[in-house]
Interface confidence: medium
């Protein structure tokens, strides 16, 4: 059965915490992803960016969790209007920026 939105967001945040805390080397071998605007539609935009990273087991669970938040199917090569034009950042920075943003949403009670 579906988990409450607050629980799902908490679990996603804790997975992002887990990734950032356990970094001993550059995440996903320093792979770069498109930066996104952390405003509306953040879950789909984040998935559209991260789905282009393959062969990185550290973020596979995050990709699956984001898929549960995004109402439409996302596939590699799909680019959102929320993408920051021509700006790529390391996966590690992307994950941490997403973590900080989602923690703010959680504090403010914005679970969807």
């Amino acid at each position: 059965s579906p988990v409450p939105p607050s629980t799902a967001l908490k679990e996603l945040i804790e997975e992002l915490v887990n990734i950032t805390q356990n970094q001993k080397a550059p995440l996903c071998n320093g792979s770069m992803v498109w930066s996104i605007n952390l405003t509306a539609g953040v879950y789909c935009a984040a998935l559209e960016s991260l789905i282009n990273v393959s062969g990185c087991s550290a973020i596979e669970k995050t990709q699956r969790m984001l898929n549960g938040f995004c109402p439409h199917k996302v596939s590699a090569g799909q680019f959102s209007s929320l993408r920051v034009r021509d700006t790529k950042i390391e996966v590690a920075q992307f994950v941490k920026d997403l973590l900080v943003h989602l923690k703010k949403l959680f504090r403010e009670g914005q679970f969807n």
Epitope: K10, I13, E14, V17, N18, T20, Q21, N22, Q23, K24, L27, A92, Q93, K96, L99, V100, K103
Partner: antibody, heavy 122, light 108 residues
């Protein structure tokens, strides 16, 4: 308003014990991780211990492991630090501090008590 | 265990910008918090999660964090900003909190 008040400090001989308490008010105590942080005279901040919001996890600095015990009573909104086998190097101001809690990590310390002085001397 | 390195002291003239650094291995992957402590007082949180500010802290205080260095920036420094400043992270390898050694900010 939100407040933390420490008590129980004083002068104690090396090898003896002391129990510090921290009374919380103005917020939902049971939902926050709680920490003890100390500061020796003229020195920097040193983290001592944390207890999870529900008491399920406790972690200690290596310097106090096996000698200090952190506990909490959520029904009374109190945090405690039992300090045994005290040493001269434990002399410090002891602060309790509140930190929002995720499962794997603590957040920033957003509320601090005023501190209580512990002096270990013969 | 994880080590955070801060310069012991930083001096700045009133109205200028002070930058206090906090070095640590891959610190950019961690969330860094900063505290201000004035003599005889408890520490006060001034920046959390690298760059966020508690509601009562002036906009003059800001933070950044990438690579191996986190930085606390205080713009338009005032005499009242003179204090010790500490950076802090959570270290998952030891399940504990780590503080930097502290930086004494002197306003000339």
């Amino acid at each position: 308003q939100m407040q933390l008040v420490e008590s129980g400090g004083g002068v104690v001989q090396p090898g003896r014990s002391l129990r510090l308490s921290c009374a919380a008010s103005g917020f939902t105590f049971r939902t926050y991780g709680m920490h003890w942080v100390r500061q020796a005279p003229g020195k920097g901040l040193e983290w001592v211990a944390v207890i999870w919001y529900d008491g399920s996890n406790k972690h200690y600095a290596d310097s106090v492991k096996g000698r200090f015990t952190i506990t909490r009573d959520n029904s009374k909104n109190t945090l405690n630090l039992q300090m045994n086998s005290l040493r001269a190097e434990d002399t410090a101001v002891y602060y309790c501090a509140r930190a929002p809690q995720w499962e794997l990590t603590a957040e920033a310390f957003d509320i601090w008590g005023q501190g209580t002085m512990v002096t270990v001397s013969s | 265990s994880y080590v955070l390195t801060q310069p012991p002291s930083v001096s700045v003239a009133p109205g200028q910008t002070a930058r206090i650094t906090c070095g640590g291995n891959l610190i950019g992957s961690k969330l860094v918090h900063w505290y201000q402590q004035k003599p005889g007082q408890a520490p006060v949180l001034v920046v959390y999660d690298d760059s966020d500010r508690p509601s009562l802290i002036p906009e003059r205080f800001s933070g950044s964090n990438s690579g191996n260095t986190a930085t606390l920036t205080i713009s338009r420094v005032e005499a009242g900003d003179e204090a010790d400043y500490y950076c802090q992270v959570w270290d998952s390898s030891s399940d504990g909190v780590v503080f930097g050694g502290g930086t004494k900010l002197t306003v000339l």
